[in-house]
């Protein structure tokens, strides 16, 4: 077959080819930020000629054009400046209201490099209607100006702009407009990952409810959807595998879906995942009817086995057939469970469609969506039982209208997105399910996104201050209890002056709490073995502090999971009959277990906890410490089995002021405290200028650094004695 000519350069930009110069290959142009390619793509036809999708005239030279943002068509009850036909990237538009009207939304908006305005739609409202004035987004025209219960407003976009969101909205009894705000956008515009992740995440978190099933009192969240323990979520992942998706892009689709699966299983809900790849025909790799769909490893392995070549004989984009296979799956499940049963009616369904283009065969995908809505009986009351997310990737041939038609429309949420490329998709899926926004006491959740603050990454981390100076660290293990080290409290029992500083989203300095009660292990006595020549002994170095008030859960304050509790068992996704021993075997399962602690400056530092034979050689070094232990005969007199040991090779050593802080590990995107920092042979902070400077021990140091942490698996009786009514402990 003839190949297509290679004279396809774009001035000021670059291009990629999905299958070289051969027929069927898709050429995709890209331009630097702030510019867009025209045309966006070309397809190599079997005749050996390039064709521009949607073009009517012959091949024109590809160029990078400046991105512009749409102008307001009308702005009610106020004025905007400057008045331009469209706005350049970086350009501002300002809004002011007439007397008697209050501005809601952003008074100044800036045109971003993706052709989208920052901020929120500006509205001049006098608060007269049953519903607030829904406003008119930039580039849109609205008909309908009554905002009473039952009134409707309709939107369309001017010139060649594309509408996403709801073209019609109704003022509902609760004073909220139905659907989602319409936005008019340039056909070439796309979404930035940092905008999509939270929007998608918020919607998804609403849907999941992510309720901690062990909570004594259930609190609702967001759209107040609760997937209780009896509730169930069916997640359907639809991956486009058509010709225009390169093999590399398909791999990223798969990887992104894996991330999604991994995250979804870290929520404490019952979930089944279906995997469907599609081109001209769909291929079901995992059905929700299969028991394995509830098993994360099985789902991920079926994803890994998804093969790009499965669809090489049919390379069109049949989105209808893909959605129809979801419908058929639902139909089978309904027949199996019984249409009238709670088991069927209580299942929530989420469909995530990852595509790079418009459907070009098999009929309108909207028909399949209508069938799905019908079988699930989606009406105003049951609107929360279905969410369809339509995610277009790679601006080129993605049809905004179609994506918008497929995506769900819910107040304050977005379900349709277009991302620039698969790399952006990967970024979104990495950050979208940020459970840390939840308000309940779900444990062990830290925000892992790149732009999170230290406190958001380790929201359980607290600072303990006896007076003005900080002395120790600790970890929230519930909304009112902090776990720390006993040796921090050496001033007798007067803790009235002590404060615990807990993370707070409203203040970078955190929030101070008084201590209602300090429970210091009675077994702790630093001088207990002085007559044996052990000048300091740290056995039983553990304490609990009950704060005077409950901490409000937030992105900056949330408990860590304590092993051997039901809360941790759920986070580990372990079966119900699990024991404390099972948790120890799962978490401390290697000779060298990677773990972390939090530094004085809030950053997360790495250590390796030595187990088994390696624990013995790790602890042995203590015999070289002649000042603290002048005539030590048996290392185990000092390093009892209550301690975990770290500090070898590349490990960081904790400073004295980091004592009491959590030693924790990450499993399944959740964090578990296995120890607490107690004592060590080297202090990297000693005499440093500030919290940011640590000195590594010289290689020749005798003894070499070693650090010892109270092992929480060895403190179970004491923890259970004092926290029995706070946490739900598993059998030992």
């Amino acid at each position: 077959a003839p190949s297509c000519p290679q004279n396809v350069n774009i001035s000021g930009g670059t291009f990629t080819l999905s299958h070289g110069w051969a027929p069927g290959s898709l050429l995709t142009y890209s331009c630097p930020q702030g510019l867009y390619p025209s045309p966006a793509s070309r397809l190599c036809k079997s005749s050996g000629q390039w064709q521009t999708p949607g073009a009517t005239r012959s091949l024109s030279k590809a160029v990078c054009k400046p991105v512009r943002c749409p102008a307001p068509v009308s702005f009610e009850n106020g004025i905007y400046t400057p008045r331009l036909g469209s706005y350049p990237v970086g350009g501002n538009v300002s809004f002011e209201c007439e007397d008697g009207f209050i501005l809601r939304g952003s008074p100044v908006r800036q045109c971003r490099p993706n052709g989208m305005w920052d901020g929120e739609t500006a509205v001049c409202d006098n608060g007269a209607g049953h519903c607030p004035n829904p406003g008119i987004s930039l580039g849109a025209v609205r008909t309908g100006f009554r905002f009473g219960h039952g009134d409707k407003v309709r939107y369309r976009c001017s010139s060649n702009l594309v509408l996403t969101g709801s073209s019609e909205r109704e003022c509902q009894g609760n004073g909220v407009w139905s659907g989602t705000e319409p936005i008019c956008r340039q056909p070439y515009s796309y979404d930035f990952p940092e905008d999509v992740a939270p929007a998608l995440g918020t919607s998804f978190s609403h849907m999941l409810g992510a309720t901690n099933p062990t909570q004594k009192t259930k609190e609702s969240l967001g759209r107040k959807i609760q997937i209780q323990r009896s509730g169930h979520l069916n997640l359907y992942l639809l991956l486009d595998c058509s010709q225009s998706v390169s093999e590399n892009d398909f791999l990223i689709f798969k990887e992104s879906a894996s991330l999604m699966v991994d995250r979804i299983f870290s929520f404490e809900i019952n979930v089944s995942v279906a995997i469907i790849t599609f081109a001209s025909e769909p291929k079901v790799l995992m059905s929700v009817l299969n028991d394995n769909s509830r098993d994360m490893t099985e789902v991920i392995s079926s994803l890994e086995n998804a093969n790009y070549k499965d669809h090489e004989n049919g390379t069109g984009t049949n989105t209808y057939a893909a959605l129809n296979s979801v419908y058929l799956m639902m139909n089978n499940q309904m027949r199996l469970l019984g249409m009238e049963t709670m088991a069927w009616q209580e299942i929530r369904h989420a469909i995530i469609l990852l595509t790079d283009g418009k459907s070009n065969m098999g009929g309108s995908p909207k028909t399949a969506v209508d069938h799905i809505r019908e079988i699930l009986n989606i009406n105003q009351k049951r609107n929360d039982y279905l969410d369809i997310y339509a995610i277009g990737v790679g601006k080129l041939d993605v049809d905004w209208r179609e994506l918008n038609e497929l995506g769900s429309k819910k107040d304050g949420e977005r379900h349709a997105f277009i991302l620039q490329d698969t790399k952006a998709l990967h970024q979104v899926f990495e950050h979208m399910l940020d459970v840390s926004k939840l308000t309940d006491t779900i444990c062990g959740v830290g925000n892992m996104s790149a732009n999170a603050s230290d406190q958001e990454r380790t929201p359980w981390h607290v600072t303990i201050k006896p007076k003005s100076q900080e002395t120790c660290r600790g970890a929230l293990i519930s909304d009112q209890w902090v776990l720390t080290a006993a040796h921090c409290f050496r001033d007798g029992n007067d803790h009235s002056l002590w404060r615990v500083n807990v993370g707070d989203p409203k203040s970078q300095w955190g929030k101070e709490f008084l201590i209602e009660k300090a429970v210091i292990s009675p077994g702790f006595d630093v001088f207990a073995k002085k007559n044996q020549g052990i000048l300091e002994f740290y056995g039983d170095d553990i304490a609990l502090l009950k704060l005077a008030q409950k901490v409000k859960m937030s992105t900056h304050a949330r408990p860590i999971c304590l092993p051997c509790t039901m809360e941790a068992n759920l986070a580990l996704r372990r079966p119900q009959g699990s024991t404390c021993r099972d948790h120890e075997n799962e978490l401390l399962n290697k000779q060298s277990v990677p773990a972390h602690f939090v530094a004085l400056n809030g950053s997360k530092l790495n250590i390796n906890l030595k187990m088994g034979v390696e624990w013995t050689s790790c602890a042995e070094v203590v015999s070289q410490e002649k000042t603290m232990f002048p005539n030590l005969t048996d290392v185990r007199e000092v390093v009892t089995d209550q301690f975990l040991c770290s500090g070898t090779q590349e490990d960081e050593s904790p400073c004295k002021g980091e004592s009491g802080g959590a030693v924790f590990l990450e499993r399944r995107f959740r964090f578990f405290q296995v120890g607490l920092v107690s004592w060590g042979l080297y202090n990297p902070c000693l005499g440093s200028a500030d919290k940011n400077s640590r000195k590594r021990a010289p290689r020749s140091k005798v003894p070499p650094p070693r650090d010892f942490h109270i092992n929480l698996f060895r403190m179970q009786p004491w923890l259970r004695q004092h926290l029995g009514d706070v946490l739900n402990f598993l059998p030992l």
């Epitope: 100076q469 050496r490 001033d491 630093v526 000048l535 000042t627 000693l686 440093s688 500030d690 919290k691």
Partner: nanobody
């Protein structure tokens, strides 16, 4: 907060010895890590030695290891620094410091003495 007063500084010949004392007021002396810092003319303040609140563990800067010894007497609320084999480069104002955590971060220390001058010169 602990109030600290140093004494014992003076002029001494190279190779000589000197014992500095630091007297602390306040009944919480026994629960503080204590340390010595020094500042030579035109230089930054630097860590010299520290001792734990129990007296069981001590730390020294490499430059003084083997020549200086830090000790404390909790019954007298006093900290000591025995300095032997003094060198010209030990000339500095010596400060005593108290720190509850034991890290002695210069940015965070709020209990300092006023200092005592040690001059090592022939």
């Amino acid at each position: 907060q602990v109030q600290l007063v140093e004494s014992g500084g003076g002029l001494v010949q190279p190779g000589g010895s000197l014992r500095l004392s630091c007297s602390a007021s306040g009944h919480t002396f026994r629960s503080y890590y204590m340390g010595w810092f020094r500042q030579a003319p035109g230089k930054e303040r630097e860590f010299v030695a520290s001792i734990s609140w129990t007296g069981g563990s001590t730390e020294y800067a490499d430059s003084v290891k083997g020549r200086f010894t830090i000790s404390r007497d909790n019954s007298k609320n006093t900290l000591y620094l025995q300095m032997n084999s003094l060198k010209a480069e030990d000339t500095a104002v010596y400060y005593c410091a108290a720190d509850y955590s034991g890290d002695f971060l210069l940015s965070d220390l709020d209990s300092w003495g006023q200092g005592t001058l040690v001059t090592v010169s022939s």
